[in-house]
Every structure is written in C-alpha cells, then in structure tokens.
Amino acid sequence: NQDLPVIKCVLINHKNNDSSVGKSSSYPMVSESPEDLGCALRPQSSGTVYEAAAVEVDVSASITLQVLVDAPGNISCLWVFKHSSLNCQPHFDLQNRGVVSMVILKMTETQAGEYLLFIQSEATNYTILFTVSIRNTLLYTLRRPYFRKMENQDALVCISESVPEPIVEWVLCDSQGESCKEESPAVVKKEEKVLHELFGTDIRCCARNELGRECTRLFTIDLNQTPQTTLPQLFLKVGEPLWIRCKAVHVNHGFGLTWELENKALEEGNYFEMSTYSTNRTMIRILFAFVSSVARNDTGYYTCSSSKHPSQSALVTIVEKGFINATNSSEDYEIDQYEEFCFSVRFKAYPQIRCTWTFSRKSFPCEQKGLDNGYSISKFCNHKHQPGEYIFHAENDDAQFTKMFTLNIRRKPQVLAEASASQASCFSDGYPLPSWTWKKCSDKSPNCTEEITEGVWNRKANRKVFGQWVSSSTLNMSEAIKGFLVKCCAYNSLGTSCETILLNSPGPFPFIQDN
C-alpha cells in the first residue's frame, strides 16, 4: 500500500442564515470549522474503500462533505447517490491537494443515505463512502432546570434532565428590575452546575442544548422591598421541587428569619439559613424553604417573618398538570393607516409557555413579559399595517392555547376590474367595506353620470385572503350597454375610487383607472 494516497474526509456545517450556501457548489461562504470524519481504510473489501465516520444532520441543515486528496498528478471523480451519478468537479487548494466537495442544502429525508465518491488518480482508483442520516430529534428533550441542595454544603446544584446533555449556567444579577435584562452589564454568567454565592438579588439557572434554552428563576421574597399589593404566586406541579428564598438586610446581626406555611412553622429539614456581612458591614440573611417533591397539601401561603422587617408572603399553588389561562375569544381591531398599534395577550400559565405569532402563513418570534400580578403579556407590533387575520399560539408541556385577531386598516378603496363576454366585475379591499355604483358613459352622459341599476350584483366579502375581506360588484352585460364605456365606483367614509371599462365584443378589455 505504498502508493495509496493520503486522504482526509471532513464535514462542514453551514449556518442556516447563510444565503450564500449553494450559490457555488465548491465554496459555500460562512461555515463552522470543518469536522474531521476520519476516513479509514475498510478492511476485507474488494478494491480500495475508505469509510468516513457516519454523519448525523439536523433536518433543514446545510452541509458540505469534503475529501482532500494528497496524491501526485490530476484526479477525476464521480459521486453516486441512490444509483444516480452526480457531477464532480475537483479543484486544488494552496497545498496542492485535490479537493472534492458535495454540498447538501437544507437536509431532508430524501437526501439521507450513502454517498459514494469514486476517485481515479494517476496512480490508483479508490472509493470513499459517506453515510448521512437525519438526527432523530424526537428523542431530544430540553427540560426546565430545577434546584437541589448540595449534600453537606450551603450551595445549590442546578439540574436539567435533558438529551443531549445540556450546558448549565447560572445567571446572576445584583441590581433591580430592568437592569437585570439578559444582556445588561449588571448580569454575570457562570457556566457551572454548583452555585455557592446565594446572596444575589436575582438568581436564575439556564440549561441549553440543540433544542434551545430554558431557565428557572430562584423564587425570592425580599423583606427590604415594600410589600406589594398583589401577593406573589408560585405554581408547581405535583412531584416538582419547591424552592423559595427569603432575603433580608439589617444594620446588625440582631434579627432572625422564620418560614411558616399557613401559620405553622416549617418542619426541620425543610429550610436552611445562610448569613454574610456585606461590604458596608450590614448583615444579609437568607432563609431557604424547600420541599424535594411537592404534594397537593404543600399548597398554601408561605410567610417569611423577621423581627426587624415587615413579613411577606407568597401563595404556592400545587397543580396536577400545567395550564394556560387566557380569554380565547377572537378580537377585531380597526385602525388608521399610520396609527401605532400592538396586539396583546394577557395570560397566566405554568410551566412557562412557548409561543408564536402567525400572519399569512408566516411565523414571527414571540416575546413574553411578566407582570407584577402573576400574569404575563405577549405583544405583537410588527404587523406593518397589513390587514388580515393574526394568530397567537401558545403551548407548554400540558396545554395549548390559540387566539385569533383580525386587523382592519381604514383606507380608501382601490378598484381592480376584469371583464368577460357576458359581464364586467370590479373588486376592492378598502375598509370599511365599500358600497358600489355603476355608471354609463354616453353622448347623453359624457361625464358618466347615468346610473346603471339593472343587472348589478354586489357581493360583500366574497373572498377572504388571510382574513382580509374583499368586496366585489358584477355587472351583467345587456344589449343596452354593449359597446359603451361603463364606470364602477367603490366608496366608503374615506373616499371613492373608480375604474372605467369598455364593454365591446369579446376580446381584451381596456380599463381606465380614474381616482
């Protein structure tokens, strides 16, 4: 095997926002760094066969299978996939290696299978085998992280039982409110499972894998904050762990914290306390209440008390299964062409929802914001004043919710006309839906003022295009109007629009729009 070439097989994953992929089969532009697929000689095979490591690809991903051949002289090649021959154009890189590429755009089931590459060099012939399969993401899961106390240590472990194994990170913030947004400079991220610094203002744990990112906030009552008018509410499902942190700061150590559930002190083993001095020598105490696996009877008011602070409570509600509470009645809106407007849905849900806004078969990202009263809100403002039907869809592990909105844009009608041998029709999408008039233009009525009432048939909202109503009016042709110009006019409270049609014998009809 002295004269066997040195072969390298690589996989290049392309970022899917990369519109350049596929413009040139040789050089897709933006990509991840190549992944070495090994390419080992297959033993006991007739002829020289190299086998690359199996490739698993996500649905819709774009990849390049690439072979680098270090052999003297020219090479020729041929790809074979499912008994079809595919064109192959080798080129040479800067190190004078032969490079052969196969680009697979937007991977589908039909593109999965064995790709055979036959290479002929001056010295020898050989075959390279790639096996490409679609990654079975049905087996993938991404579960919301939960907390556990670390054995014999005052620390929390963050756990997310997900496949593939997720990367776990703590997201910490020490300021209040808006400044704790994900990308704020006040936010610190720690890519580790165990957290010892538990005194921060806002503590979240996030887990991410191929399916996305899920986070859980450590539910906190801060006794130094003024008691809210609405009690914070925490939902959990039976069997989930409960963690509530009570935090208080005082000028000295002369205070203690206690947890009560429905006026009864929590049992030993269901809480632990930590204290520290802050930089200005004030004392910070935190007291955790926890239940490793909640049951229905853990529902109730959990009250954290201190001799030096107003006590505060949270209502913990244990449910059998998740829910999404919101009004699903459809809503209709009518706005002006330049009016600022957002759709909004207010809901209470557990576990947290995943949601989308859809218009005209196109999905838009959905953001949700928590309100003080335990509700969340999702707004959609990116409608670009396009009338039609907008759909909000939300789901979590246990529930689904859909709400329909109709957006009407107030505008003057625009008229389109079409004609056949027997009739003329006019269409308009103005809003409010227009009324119609037909007028005949003749020597007696050069300004087209002679109204036509016979043979007119109006249909309001006969065609719904993604929720956008279209009104039409049809004039049946009679001998009395054949050969004349007629004018159809649509009018509503915002104005009038007309189009003139020449009713001659069959053939193309000229239309004269006249607004």
Epitope: L231, N263, T303, S305, K308, P310, S311, S313
Partner: nanobody
C-alpha cells in the same frame, strides 16, 4: 376564607385624629400578620403599616411617629391610630391579611 371589614373612617380637620378598625372573621388566625394600605384618588395603593403575629410593628418611614398599629387577638381585630392628620392623608384605607382585602374605609382630612 377570610373576611375583613374596616370601619372608623370619616371627615376630620387637619391636625385631628382617627382610629380605624379592621375586624377579621372566617378561617383567620392570631398568627397572621395584618397590613394597612391606603389609596388616594388617582394614585396607586401604598403600604402604610404592618403588625406581625408576635406584635412587632413596621411602618412606612414617612408615617412613623404619627400612625400606630395594634391588634387585639381575642377580638380578631387590628387598629390603626392616626394622629396629626394632614390633607395628604386623605384616602381610602384598606386592611389586608395574606391575599384577602377589606372593602376599605374613606378618610377625608380637610384643611
């Protein structure tokens, strides 16, 4: 369920005093803490004072010294003694236990 009923509000001149009562009934307990809140016309509801089950008291800092909260566990009633009243104390006063609220009692301070 807990029911709360405030009383003792009324019209008083600036500098005067009033004593509000909050009577609790239903499944309440002397171990519950009690809060007083108030809401002036066109403003958000704000916290005034709290008495804990052990009798510890806490006040909105700007009201400390003029207002005093107390409780009588035998009668299941909390009180808010308001002295040196000012026109800006005009509001509806509410008591709260956990997530339960009373209907409120109107306090009007005239100048």
């Amino acid at each position: 369920q807990v029911q709360l009923q405030e009383s003792g509000g009324g019209l008083v001149q600036a500098g005067g005093s009033l004593r509000l009562s909050c009577a609790a009934s239903g499944s309440t307990s002397s171990r519950n803490y009690i809060d007083w809140y108030r809401q002036a016309p066109g403003k958000q509801r704000e916290w005034v004072a709290q008495i804990t089950s052990g009798g510890n008291t806490h006040y909105e800092p700007s009201l400390k010294g003029r207002f005093t909260i107390s409780r009588d566990n035998a009668k299941n009633t909390a009180y808010l003694q308001m002295n040196s009243l000012k026109p800006e104390d005009t509001a509806v006063y509410y008591c709260r236990i956990l997530d339960y609220w009373g209907q409120g009692t109107q306090v009007t301070v005239s100048s």
